[in-house]
């Protein structure tokens, strides 16, 4: 058998995306190992001196941890042992963008892996159904996005169509002078037809559809990530 | 030993603003997270926000948004919460509670004895 | 805003097992919920009990449990004693904000 920290372990990392104000996870998982007691997990970011979060001997070891994450950060202990070195991030801040590195110390050896983790601000888009308007249009909102998204149009019926010259946008800085609420309206529309919504930054794209007949409006609405992945 | 001491009653009359203190003692002020939560009669517990003291980082429920603001003063360990534009509606107790935020728990351990707000003209 | 039903008063009896439980209206409560239990007792007298679902607050008494049950977060009080008669309240974390159920009367 391998003596321990001779041998390189297997980490995995997979490039993922914070939504500010919110919790977010940096993900990181490692060749089992069932002695909890002999593993180490240690994030680091770069430029940063100090550590982002340390846990060894089945608890936390915050003595070195750096102070822009002193109360946010916690490892999933309970899921340690199976191999989930992931981290747990309180209240996404912006500046928690970065290079992180998992680093694994396990009785079987040691390894470790990069991320790369983006913040912004993200939000699903509801289209609703302008009434008072002059001629009927559609009002699509979203409450936070950043950095400040495109916004574009689309219908089914009229596939390829530029509606930038019918729809007005506009970005509305939200109380905390980060994220900013989007509302774009499309006028001229007609009924029997489906209307798409996109949304888009470099860190996520939210889509919402909306489809008005005479006897009904159908909404559906969706958010991917961008980037995100091994 | 770890306690929350929260400042005395307040009557306060509509329109005004109110600030009220939450001094820690026992612990690492700044390890922990301040929650602020209101109880009013036949409302239950609504929480309000929480302030991560020594850092500006704070989360508030959309509905205390624009009636609340924290503060906290490391050097006194003593965390704020300011109420503005004061209406009957803002008549409750309020408490502070200290929440760990860790990888083995994540709890609201310690609660202050609440400060009593009542808004009358 | 999501809302959080907890029952309203339980009966028990000194030495019996009682479980308060905490619903939400989203669907099914989960560990990312952080489920938190704290009791009330007179005069505005609140402590927290269980954190993170099922971690018990230092110096809480082993009787007191917290787990999921289906799709609920779950207090289990083993062998209750007179002085747990109260009011508890769970909460529950919604990725940046806390719920608080409407409280449960334990008689």
């Known amino acids: 058998f391998g003596i321990s920290g001779k041998h390189f372990i297997t980490v995995t990392t997979f490039t993922s995306a914070g939504n500010i104000g919110e919790d977010g996870t940096l993900s990181c998982t490692f060749e089992p190992d069932i002695k909890l007691n002999g593993i180490v997990i240690q994030w680091l970011k770069e430029g940063i001196k100090g550590l982002v979060h340390e846990f060894k001997e089945g608890k936390d070891d915050l003595s070195q941890q750096h102070e822009m994450f002193r109360g946010r950060t916690a490892v999933f202990a309970d899921q340690v042992v199976v191999g989930n070195a992931s981290l747990r991030l309180k209240n996404v801040q912006l500046t928690d963008a970065g290079t992180y590195t998992c680093y694994i110390r396990t009785s079987k050896g040691k390894g470790n892996a990069n991320l790369e983790y983006k913040t912004g601000a993200f939000s699903m888009p509801e289209i609703n159904v302008d009434y008072n308007a002059s001629s009927e249009s559609l009002r699509c909102e979203a409450p936070r996005w950043f950095p400040q998204p495109t916004v574009a149009w689309a219908s089914q019926v009229d596939q390829g169509a530029n509606f930038s010259e019918v729809s007005n946008t506009s970005f509305e800085l939200n109380s905390e002078n980060v994220t900013m609420k989007v509302v774009s309206v499309l006028y001229n529309v007609t009924i029997n037809n489906t209307y798409s919504c996109m949304i888009e930054n470099d860190i996520a794209k939210a889509t919402g559809d909306i489809k008005v007949t005479d006897s009904e409006v159908k909404r559906r609405s969706q958010l991917q990530l961008l980037n995100s992945g091994p | 030993q770890v306690q929350l001491q929260q400042s005395g009653a307040e009557l306060m009359k509509p329109g005004a603003s109110v600030k009220m203190s939450c001094k820690a003692t026992?612990?690492?002020?700044?390890?922990?997270?301040i929650e602020w939560v209101k109880q009013r009669p036949g409302h239950g517990l609504e929480w309000i926000g929480e302030?991560?003291?020594?850092?500006?980082?704070?989360t508030y429920n959309a509905k205390f948004k624009v009636k609340a603001t924290f503060t906290a003063d490391t050097s006194s360990n003593t965390a704020y919460m300011q109420l503005s534009s004061l209406t009957s509606e803002d008549s409750a107790v309020y408490f502070c509670?200290?929440?760990?935020?860790?990888?083995?728990?994540?709890?609201?351990?310690?609660w202050g004895q609440g400060t009593s707000l009542t808004v009358s003209s | 805003q999501a809302v959080v039903t907890q029952e309203s008063a339980l009966t028990t009896s000194p030495g019996d097992t009682v479980t308060l439980t905490c619903r939400s209206s989203?669907?099914?409560?989960?560990?990312?919920?952080?489920a938190n239990w704290v009791q009330e007792k007179p005069d505005h007298l609140f402590t927290g009990l269980i954190g993170?679902?099922?971690n018990r607050v230092p110096g809480v008494p082993a009787r007191f449990s917290g787990s999921l049950i289906g799709d609920k977060a779950a207090l289990t009080i083993t062998g209750a004693q007179t002085e747990d008669e109260a009011m508890y309240f769970c909460?529950?974390?919604?990725?940046?904000?806390?719920?608080f159920g409407g409280g449960t009367k334990l008689e």
């Open positions: 509670a200290r929440y760990y935020f860790g990888s083995s728990s994540f709890y609201f351990d310690y």
């Open positions: 026992g612990y690492t002020f700044s390890s922990y997270w």
């Open positions: 989203t669907g099914a409560v989960t560990t990312s919920n952080y």
């Open positions: 909460a529950l974390w919604y990725n940046n904000h806390w719920v």
């Open positions: 993170g679902t099922n």
């Open positions: 302030i991560l003291p020594g850092t500006s980082i704070t």
